[in-house]
Interface confidence: low
């Protein structure tokens, strides 16, 4: 057994939140404040995310799991593991780069992120528009004039909108 | 430690192009963002754009749009930055500089500086 | 794009001083500002973050304080170490921008 071990890699018996230190003869040392390894057999320790400036601290860093940020008030997180913070706008708004704009007449944003999508367009569907939109919320589409007859079905939801992506910053 | 290493001092004829590297070492390449800031002989500091590599894309400065190309290799930790057109002006020590998180954000780590020399 | 003026452009002290830096954004940037150090042929050193914190490692005899418009650096004892080039900056929005800087030299 022993000596099928020490055949072995020696780091491979380090385990997360620690690494293995070249510099003491491949000893596992544990990482040092502000670094982690979240697996074992780690020749180095990686340096903790640090949430700062439009970032806050939502996890905190361990020594075997890096520190997970979220954004602070009137900010959103785009990206993996919120790698970015992008502004809140209102909704009727979108984030362009020169800040939050009203959205065009004819177009609509009904969340605080996200870019303005264009009303549908009920008469694609051969209906008629119910109730007019605004910036803040689609078109409501009714049936066609031509079902307006007794027994006539009642209003449909607009056609789900497009994903909503995010301007560039 | 993270480490920031920029490749060495150029000299450039008006009108031609620069490509200046940034290779990191020391932490996770991918999920910071990348800016460059220059600084003319005796002046300030200025940021020209920057990326996240985990994404690929850039954002520019609007001085700089169009003249100025960002970019990393993943897989070397290596960001990029290309000036094209260059004139007299451009001469500047060029930095990379990393964010902890995104962009906008503070500047915790600097590479060491490539000096650019535009000259005819 | 936000403008940050800092005053005054030179300052001379001496050792033991009490030296404050004033930087001013043309629009309020909350408090999304930090200080940085420069030594001549180096890079900038981050001092302080979202206008009063500490970065990791920097001495205590730098203070940073201000929201808004108007932010301040203080140096509470000038050190020989701390002849240099102070720049702030904001990162309420892009692009993130520098004031012009500050230069610190002995009296």
């Known amino acids: 057994f022993e000596r099928t071990r020490s055949l072995q890699d020696p780091c491979s018996n380090c385990p997360a939140g620690t690494f293995c230190d070249n510099n003491r003869n491949q000893i596992c040392s544990p990482c040092p404040p502000n670094s982690f390894s979240s697996a074992g057999g780690q020749r180095t320790c990686d340096i903790c995310r640090q949430c700062k400036g439009v970032f806050r601290t939502r996890k905190e860093c361990s020594s075997t799991s890096n520190a997970e940020c979220d954004c602070t008030p009137g900010f959103h997180c785009l990206g993996a593991g919120c790698s970015m913070c992008e502004q809140d706008c209102k909704q009727g708004q979108e984030l362009t780069k020169k800040g939050c704009k009203d959205c065009c007449f004819g177009t609509f944003n009904d969340q605080k992120r996200g870019i303005c999508r264009p009303w549908t367009n009920c008469s694609l569907d051969g209906k008629s528009v119910l109730v007019n939109g605004t910036k803040e919320r689609d078109v409501v589409c009714g049936p066609s004039p031509a079902d307006l007859s007794p027994g006539a079905s009642s209003v449909t939801p607009p056609a789900p909108a497009r994903e909503p992506g995010h301007s560039p910053q | 430690q993270v480490q920031l290493v920029q490749s060495g001092a150029e000299v450039k004829k008006p009108g031609s192009s620069v490509k200046v590297s940034c290779k990191a070492s020391?932490?996770?390449?991918?999920?910071?963002?990348i800016s460059w800031v220059r600084q003319a002989p005796g002046q300030g500091l200025e940021w020209m754009g920057g990326?996240?590599?985990?994404?690929?894309?850039?954002n520019y400065a609007q001085k700089f749009q169009g003249r100025v190309t960002i970019t990393a290799d993943k897989s070397t930790s290596t960001a990029y930055m290309e000036l094209s057109s260059l004139r007299s002006e451009d001469t500047a020590v060029y930095y990379c500089?990393?964010?902890?998180?995104?962009?906008?954000?503070?500047?915790?780590?600097w590479g060491q500086g490539t000096t650019v020399t535009v000259s005819s | 794009d936000i403008q940050m003026t800092q005053s005054p452009s030179t300052l001379s002290a001496s050792v033991g001083d009490r030296v404050t830096i004033t930087c001013r954004a043309s629009?309020?940037?909350?408090?999304?500002l930090a200080w940085y150090q420069q030594k001549p042929g180096k890079a900038p050193k981050l001092l302080i973050y979202?206008?009063?914190s500490l970065e990791s490692g920097v001495p205590s005899r730098f203070s940073g304080s201000g929201s808004g418009t108007e932010f301040t650096l203080t140096i509470s004892s000038l050190q020989p170490d701390d002849f240099a080039t102070y720049y702030c900056?904001?990162?309420?929005?892009?692009?993130?921008?520098f004031g012009q800087g500050t230069k610190v030299e002995i009296k």
């Open positions: 500089a990393r964010s902890s998180g995104a962009y906008p954000g503070y500047f915790d780590y």
């Open positions: 020391g932490g996770t390449f991918s999920s910071y963002a």
């Open positions: 990326i996240i590599p985990i994404f690929g894309t850039a």
């Open positions: 629009q309020s940037i909350s408090s999304w």
């Open positions: 979202d206008a009063s």
């Open positions: 900056q904001q990162v309420n929005s892009y692009p993130q921008t």
